[in-house]
């Protein structure tokens, strides 16, 4: 038999991408019962957690105070239930943004446009990088990226009004140091009459999933939390 | 039960390479950090570097760079250590440790000895 | 580096007796963990994350500290105790442990 427990789950509250000086908050989401919690930063042992009482929440919360690029990276997390570790959670990234300067986002032929179209982003920022971010709002997780001295053009190919949206740019000093965003570009895609008049517009909420999702158990949840484990059992 | 069984004791010549290796079972390999640690006979413990299994990534202290170099087979479920160009100071026992909360599952150690 | 710093270098009790070594960093670590080796072995987990005993270790160990000084505590030392004892951080790269505290029964 296996001598661990199912990964936990790693989120970022709110956001992966944290102003400097502000806090960051990751959840690791584990299990009922869990008696210790670590988060682990680069291979590093980052903070350890132990929640209390722990049979009746199924993850902590791990606050950084003051980000800065010394804090940026890799994060994962992994817990205890008696003796018994977990297995590590995927890697979570964590990105310090409003580093040095504010880049300058520009869109051609313009920012109304007719779907079919061929559209390009242009992102550009005087001090030094090479790497250039961009992304569409409610879809933080969608990140382009392209390479240039001062300026990087993200071409978008014939846009449908899927891509309608608020778009923001950040020039990068390494993968999880980024610039001050970029003022925001909306999109306007036109399209047929019938598919304009169906066509969402892009929630300007975070996204969905960067919220942790932490419980304190009921009876019916523990039910259900022995019935998977038991069934889980069986499947191996 | 979870083991990390290292290859056995090894004696090379000064200027010559060679590599270690540490096989892992009883869990799910790629799921936890492997780090290599040497100890030279009769002192302390230095730690050379870590590889991440599920990617390949490694991680060394500097002053095991150009010395030691760390890889894995996921398909064996085995981390390596090749080190470059021995001399006496690499004379040492090697161990591989697991981290999962803690450096919870250690190698039993390989005998490394340089001689002419 | 974080340089860690043990004393004693050599620990010499009697059965029965509550003994205490300590552990400095040269500057704050979130974290210290112990190992526990004995002559011809591998160093096993001893104590981590600080106060944490890891799998199999009697309740007589102890671990406190913060910051730069950390300590590990045998409330009532046993013959079986007789090891050296390590300190170690992997909260900065490179991780670092301490030259270790041989602990002799007298």
């Known amino acids: 038999p296996k001598q661990t427990l199912p990964k936990p789950i790693i989120r970022a509250e709110s956001t992966y991408m944290v102003p400097k000086e502000k806090q960051a908050t990751l959840c690791c989401q584990g299990s009922y019962g869990a008696v210790e919690y670590q988060l682990h930063f680069e291979g590093s042992l980052f903070a350890v957690e132990r929640p209390k009482p722990p049979e009746r929440i199924n993850g902590v919360k791990f606050h950084i105070p003051d980000m800065n690029s010394r804090k940026a990276g890799r994060y994962s997390c992994i817990y205890r239930v008696g003796e018994l570790w977990s297995e590590r959670s995927d890697l979570l990234d964590l990105v310090v943004t409003e580093m040095y300067d504010t880049p300058t986002l520009s869109v051609h032929p313009g920012p109304e446009v007719t779907s079919g179209e061929k559209v390009t982003f242009y992102c550009r920022l005087d001090t030094a990088t090479s790497m250039f971010l961009l992304l569409k709002e409610g879809r933080s997780r969608d990140v382009q990226r392209s390479y240039g001295k001062v300026q990087a053009e993200f071409p978008m190919g014939p846009v449908t009004t899927a891509h309608r949206g608020s778009y923001r740019c950040f020039g990068s000093y390494n993968n999880y140091a980024w610039s001050f965003p970029s003022e925001p570009v909306k999109l306007l895609v036109t399209g047929d009459i019938e598919n304009t008049s169906l066509a969402p517009t892009d929630p300007t909420f975070p996204d969905s999933w960067d919220t942790c999702l932490l419980t304190r158990e009921t009876g019916l949840q523990k039910d259900l939390a022995l019935w998977d484990h038991t069934a889980q059992n069986l499947l191996r | 039960q979870v083991q990390l069984q290292q290859s056995g004791d090894d004696l090379v010549k000064p200027g010559a390479s060679v590599k270690l290796s540490c096989k892992a079972s009883g869990y799910t390999f790629t799921s936890y950090w492997i780090n290599w640690i040497k100890q030279r006979p009769g002192q302390g413990l230095e730690w050379i570097g870590r590889?991440?299994?599920?990617?390949?990534?490694?991680y060394y202290n500097e002053i095991f760079k150009g010395k030691a170099i760390l890889t894995v087979d996921s398909y064996s479920n085995t981390a390596y250590i090749q080190l470059r160009s021995v001399s006496s100071e690499d004379s040492a026992v090697y161990f591989c440790?697991?981290?999962?909360?803690?450096?919870?599952?250690w190698g039993q150690g390989i005998t490394l000895t340089v001689s002419s | 580096q974080i340089v860690l710093s043990q004393s004693p270098a050599i620990l010499s009790a009697s059965p029965g007796e509550k003994v205490t070594m300590a552990c400095r960093a040269s500057s704050s670590v979130n974290y210290i963990h112990w190992y526990q080796q004995r002559p011809g072995s591998s160093p096993k987990p001893w104590i981590y994350a600080t106060s944490s005993l890891a799998s199999g270790v009697p309740a007589r160990f102890s671990g406190s500290g913060s910051g730069t000084s950390y300590s590990l505590t045998i409330s009532r030392v046993e013959a079986e105790d007789a090891a050296t004892y390590y300190c170690?951080?992997?909260?900065?790269?490179?991780?670092?442990f301490g030259g270790g505290t041989k602990l002799e029964m007298k």
């Open positions: 590889v991440v299994p599920g990617s390949g990534r490694t």
């Open positions: 440790a697991r981290v999962g909360g803690y450096w919870d599952y």
């Open positions: 170690q951080q992997w909260s900065s790269n490179p991780y670092t």
